[in-house]
């Protein structure tokens, strides 16, 4: 029976993933019962990705390592809509690392997942980035401009945002 074997496969995948994320929240995609997309609980979901706000304060490198241990990376923001979704879950008095850095200090910004850096889809605060020694990007709130990006020193501990593709089972 097709449905039975699909369910067995799904359960075995869930069991495998449970050792990393004890609880998954899954939804049926479209009308096809075959496709379930999941995010770990209590991650949030938007389009084809899952997001986790890490409130522990760590350097940029440690923040990225923390995300990768969970099967994610520091967040790569591809659209204004994605940023608008993310900021709903952020606190205005905090700053959060993005998956964006300038390792050489030459203003060659790089996303951790190798997505090409596109000047036309960036949300820097006005006047930012402004320091060649500040090689990592955060998102924070400024009363004059609301949410935007700023360059800071990578070793300064911040909160962070992890992003992973939805888990399909």
């Amino acid at each position: 029976n097709f449905m039975y074997s699909k369910t067995v496969k799904r359960l075995s995948k869930l069991r495998e993933y449970q050792q990393y994320h004890p609880s998954l929240t899954c939804v049926m995609e479209g009308k096809d019962i075959e496709d379930w997309s999941c995010c770990p609980t209590p991650w949030t979901s938007f389009q084809s990705s899952c997001y986790f706000i890490s409130t522990g304060m760590q350097s940029w490198t440690k923040s990225q390592k923390n995300c990768s241990v969970m099967g994610a990376d520091l967040v790569v923001i591809n659209t204004r809509e994605e940023q608008d979704f993310i900021i709903q879950n952020l606190k205005r008095n905090s700053s959060y690392f993005l998956g964006l850095s300038d390792p050489g200090g030459r203003r060659h910004w790089q996303w951790v997942d190798q997505t090409p850096y596109n000047e036309n889809v960036t949300f820097w605060h006005s006047g930012e980035p402004n320091n060649l020694d500040e090689r990592c990007a955060i998102i924070n709130f400024r009363s004059s401009e609301e949410w935007g990006w700023n360059d800071i020193h990578c070793h300064v501990p911040q909160k962070s945002i992890c992003k992973m593709k939805k888990i399909y089972i």
Epitope: E16, Y17, Q19, Y20, S68, V69, M70, G71
Partner: nanobody, 126 residues
Framework: QVQLQESGGGLVQAGDSLKLSCAAS????????MGWFRQAPGKERDVVAA????????YYVDSVKGRFTISRDNAQNRVYLQMNSLKPEDTAIYYC?????FGSGYYTNKLNYAYWGQGTQVTVSS
């Protein structure tokens, strides 16, 4: 937590072959995307090859395409790098790396990898 141990390095002549092996212990190996990186003295650690969890998707840096082959054996918890037609410029310490992955992609940025082996030296003499 995943522990990785590379083996198979050594000193060979240009044109020779070597097969590197990386043994993984710890969590379910089949849920980890794997990569081979190398670091020559005074240089950055760069990706050589990468492979997805199911072994179906692979990546090679241009300089090794057609000469190196990455493969994995999920039953044995191992990933391999078969290196043929070795050149002096392949001399480096070779590192195996792992990252948890729930998709079917590979990863080419060293920042994407959470776990690393200690490395194995490969020296190619002319």
């Amino acid at each position: 937590q995943v522990q990785l141990q590379e083996s198979g390095g050594g000193l060979v002549q240009a044109g020779d072959s070597l097969k590197l092996s990386c043994a993984a212990s710890g969590r379910t190996f089949s849920t980890y995307a794997m990569g081979w990186f190398r670091q020559a003295p005074g240089k950055e650690r760069d990706v050589v090859a990468a492979i997805a969890t199911n072994g179906g998707t692979t990546y090679y840096v241009d300089s090794v395409k057609g000469r190196f082959t990455i493969s994995r054996d999920n039953a044995q918890n191992r990933v391999y790098l078969q290196m043929n037609s070795l050149k002096p410029e392949d001399t480096a310490i070779y590192y195996c790396a792992a990252r948890l992955s729930f998709g079917s992609g590979y990863y080419t940025n060293k920042l994407n990898y959470a776990y690393w082996g200690q490395g194995t030296q490969v020296t190619v003499s002319s």
